[in-house]
């Protein structure tokens, strides 16, 4: 059928043009967590730099107590990296002690909260099992997507278990958004 | 106060307008590497196609000598994906033989290099043990993030042990980045 | 040589300017898979949920049948994660046992499918040996990057093994793309 | 658990500013959206607008627009309302509400009548 | 502003009797809230996102629906479900309700 080719290519204007260089975008890095109360079933969200080092946020986008705020509604491309560290969890060990076999595990979570719905939801996870045979182990989980966005919308990245979260290097655990 | 709410997204257009066509990008792909000298303390860096199959540079975006040359100011994505393979790393064998329980472990870092540093700088790094139980292992790992780049600045991708990467096909590793 | 040296940054308009929110862009999200025939040595290729929870697609961008249909050529950015789990690959015993010592992989790679090329082209492959020690393990692969695709172009994910793919959450295996 | 208790003044004068306060506990409220909502007598709700704790960033009701003021004071976990200019029209019990970050919970309301 | 329009006004119906309350906006949206309102109480929510049970809502209560036209289900009414239910529209500019539906026990 002829309605299922593509429209032509050479109209494109439908929406008003703007400037790249004025986008809502952000790059956040991470700090040494401090514990802070959560519910019992919500992971705990992480804090992070805004300002400092590779840290920044332009165009409207702004970072406060643990989530960056949408200026502005569209698409937007949201990533996040955390490194985890831990000492090892001995799944054989475990098993053999008569544990139950379900492994450790380690999760991020990149949230949304928007006032338009009552529960907070998961955008992207990331999660895998840990069983390490060696003593100290270290690994990275990253998580890119993009989304549509409300103006007035809020992102957080929530982890299984901050004490496992490498703090120590900016370029190791981030979190960041760009409007496309 | 009212001022608090979202300035009206109307107000649009604080920059020149930009054709998305013209603006850098690249994707560079793995080559096999020829060992290089590098610094006793300092991650050695792979060199990479940029012109046949998958690998293009356009729009001044240049490679050269290992580097990705940013041709002008302005934030940018980078990302990068690396494929490690390698003979086991035997951690509990290695814990019974009385060596030091550190397990081995396999590093990316993107790295900028700029003319107002003294220091290049770690944008980007992954960093994951490696303990295996099975002979031979191989595993990918992958970054991405913004950054804020300045006409000059160069791009390069480090790793902890180039013999341990797979540039068998372009697919599996890779490096680019692009203008927002 | 002078010819060498930057363009002025300037001259920056040599393409139709083109409204962002017109841009073709998908996300896709996981939805349970029904068995399908597939070549006997091409990994299968997973199918996709485009409008309900936080899939979309927009902008002429069309999913059909496994694939996303590229409506306009350009540079996009393309991206995919895939959960992998599965009951433990148990390589020492494996070995014991005399079995090849080849571990067990799991391998995501995003395809495009071109009619100007007979076979299918891998942009790009996560593979990663699976060697538990644990019983129940699960893992993400990730992959994103850019490439010139042509209008007409079909993109999909295959993987090696459907039955290990996580179908339970929409956040943990997705897949998309969009013009830059 | 979670729990919202608005307070204020039960009668305002013709022409004055209603003022009242939203005070939460039970969760951090930052992690929500706190939103205003009226029902005048023998009528329906009105949603009069909404503030984001953690940024202060606030969304109106066009039709109060000109009259309504909310804020946020999160050393002590409040939210504040402020109506200017009442007339006998907005005599109404008055519900703050929270959404986003948890279950939607709304406060048990508060009576304002405007009268001299 | 979108204006949402609810129907019935009130009705009167027996214990395990089926209810339906329909809703209808002035234009599209993505998604309809409805709540419950006892007399002197607080509105609670019911159904969240169309067709979302609320933490805690027996599951007589349902929601379905798209676009302009949605509608609320109790499947068994029950004593304790005597009140006024209200949709509401979160995505326009104000938020608006629906002018309620008082439910009342023959």
């Known amino acids: 059928l002829k309605g299922q080719e593509f429209a032509p290519s050479h109209q494109q204007v439908y929406a008003p043009l703007r400037a790249d260089g004025d986008k809502p975008r952000a790059h956040l890095t991470v700090v040494r967590q401090t514990p802070t109360q959560h519910f019992k079933n919500q992971f705990p969200a992480l804090h992070w730099e805004h300002e400092l080092g590779l840290a920044f946020t332009k165009n409207r986008m702004n970072y406060t107590n643990k989530f960056l705020l949408i200026p502005e509604s569209g698409d937007y491309f949201i990533y996040s990296q955390v490194t985890f560290r831990g000492m090892t969890s001995e799944c054989s060990e475990i098993r053999q002690a008569g544990r139950p076999n379900k492994p450790d595990s380690i999760t991020v979570v990149i949230t949304k909260v928007t006032d338009s719905y009552p529960e907070p939801t998961q955008l992207l996870m990331g999660t895998k099992s840990v069983c390490e045979v060696g003593s100290n182990w270290f690994q990275p989980i990253y998580l890119g997507a993009m989304f549509s966005l409300q103006e007035g919308d809020k992102l957080m990245v929530n982890v299984s278990d901050i004490s496992l979260v490498d703090y120590t290097k900016e370029d190791k655990t981030f979190f960041g958004a760009f409007l496309l | 106060l009212k001022g608090q709410e979202f300035a009206p997204s109307h107000q649009q257009v604080y920059a020149p307008l930009r054709a998305d066509g013209d603006k850098p990008r690249a994707h560079l792909t793995v080559v096999r590497q020829t060992p290089t000298q590098h610094f006793k303390n300092q991650f050695p860096a792979l060199h990479w196609e940029h012109e046949l199959g998958l690998a293009f540079t356009k729009n001044r975006m240049n490679y050269t000598n290992k580097f990705l040359l940013i041709p002008e100011s302005g934030d940018y994505f980078i990302y990068s994906q690396v494929t490690f393979r390698g003979m086991t790393s035997e951690c509990s064998e290695i814990r019974q033989a009385g060596r030091p329980n550190k397990p081995d472990s396999i590093t990316v870092v993107i790295t900028k290099v700029t003319d107002s540093y003294p220091e290049p700088t770690q944008l980007l790094m992954g960093t994951k043990s490696v303990c295996e139980v099975g002979s031979n292992w191989f595993q990918p790992i992958y970054l991405g993030a913004m950054f804020s780049l300045q006409e000059g600045d160069k791009l390069m991708v480090n790793v902890s042990d180039i013999s341990l990467v797979d540039y068998t096909k372009e697919d599996k590793t890779f490096f680019g980045a692009f203008l927002l | 040589l002078k010819g060498q040296e930057f363009a002025p940054s300037h001259q920056q308009v040599y393409a139709p300017l083109r409204a962002d929110g017109d841009k073709p862009r998908a996300h896709l999200t996981v939805v349970r898979q029904t068995p399908t025939q597939h070549f006997k040595n091409q990994f299968p290729a997973l199918h996709w949920e485009h409008e309900l929870g936080l899939a979309f697609t927009k902008n002429r961008m069309n999913y059909t049948n496994k694939f996303l249909l590229i409506p306009e050529s350009g540079d996009y950015f393309i991206y995919s994660q895939v959960t992998f789990r599965g009951m433990t690959s148990e390589c020492s015993e494996i070995r014991q046992a005399g079995r090849p010592n080849k571990p067990d992989s799991i391998t995501v790679v995003i395809t495009k499918v071109t009619d100007s090329y007979p076979e299918p082209t891998q942009l790009l492959m996560g593979t990663k040996s699976v060697c538990e020690v644990g019983s129940n393990w699960f893992q993400p692969i990730y992959l994103g990057a850019m490439f010139s695709l042509q209008e007409g172009d079909k993109l999909m994910v295959n993987v090696s093994d459907i039955s290990l793919v996580d179908y339970t959450k929409e956040d943990k295996t997705f897949f998309g793309a969009f013009l830059l | 658990q979670v729990q919202l208790q608005e307070s204020g003044p039960g009668l305002v004068r013709p022409s004055q500013t209603l003022s009242l306060t939203c005070t939460v506990s039970?969760?951090?409220?930052?992690?929500?959206?706190m939103h205003w909502v009226r029902q005048r007598p023998g009528r329906g709700l009105e949603w009069m607008g909404r503030?984001?704790?953690?940024?202060?960033?606030?969304k109106y009701n066009p039709s109060l627009k000109s009259r309504v003021t909310i804020t946020r004071d999160t050393s002590k976990n409040q939210v504040s309302l402020r109506l200017s200019s009442v007339t006998a029209a907005d005599t109404a019990v008055y519900y703050c509400?929270?959404?986003?970050?948890?279950?939607?919970?709304w406060g048990q309301g508060s009576l304002v009548t405007v009268s001299s | 502003d979108i204006q949402m329009t609810q129907s019935p006004s009130s009705l009167s119906a027996s214990v395990g009797d089926r209810v339906t309350i329909t809703c209808r906006a002035s234009?599209?949206?993505?998604?309809m809230y409805w709540y419950q309102q006892k007399p002197g109480k607080a509105p609670k929510l019911l159904i969240y996102?169309?067709?979302n049970l609320a933490s805690g809502v027996p599951s007589r209560f349902s929601g379905s629906g798209s676009g302009t036209d949605f509608t609320f289900t109790i499947s068994s009414l029950q004593p304790e479900d005597i009140a006024t239910y209200y949709c509401?529209?979160?995505?326009?500019?104000?938020?608006?309700f629906g002018q309620g539906t008082k439910v009342e026990i023959k």
């Open positions: 039970g969760f951090d409220y930052q992690d929500t959206y």
């Open positions: 503030i984001d704790p953690a940024s202060g960033h606030t």
């Open positions: 996102a169309t067709s």
């Open positions: 234009q599209g949206v993505e998604y």
């Open positions: 509400a929270v959404s986003g970050g948890m279950p939607d919970v």
């Open positions: 509401q529209q979160w995505e326009g500019n104000p938020r608006t």
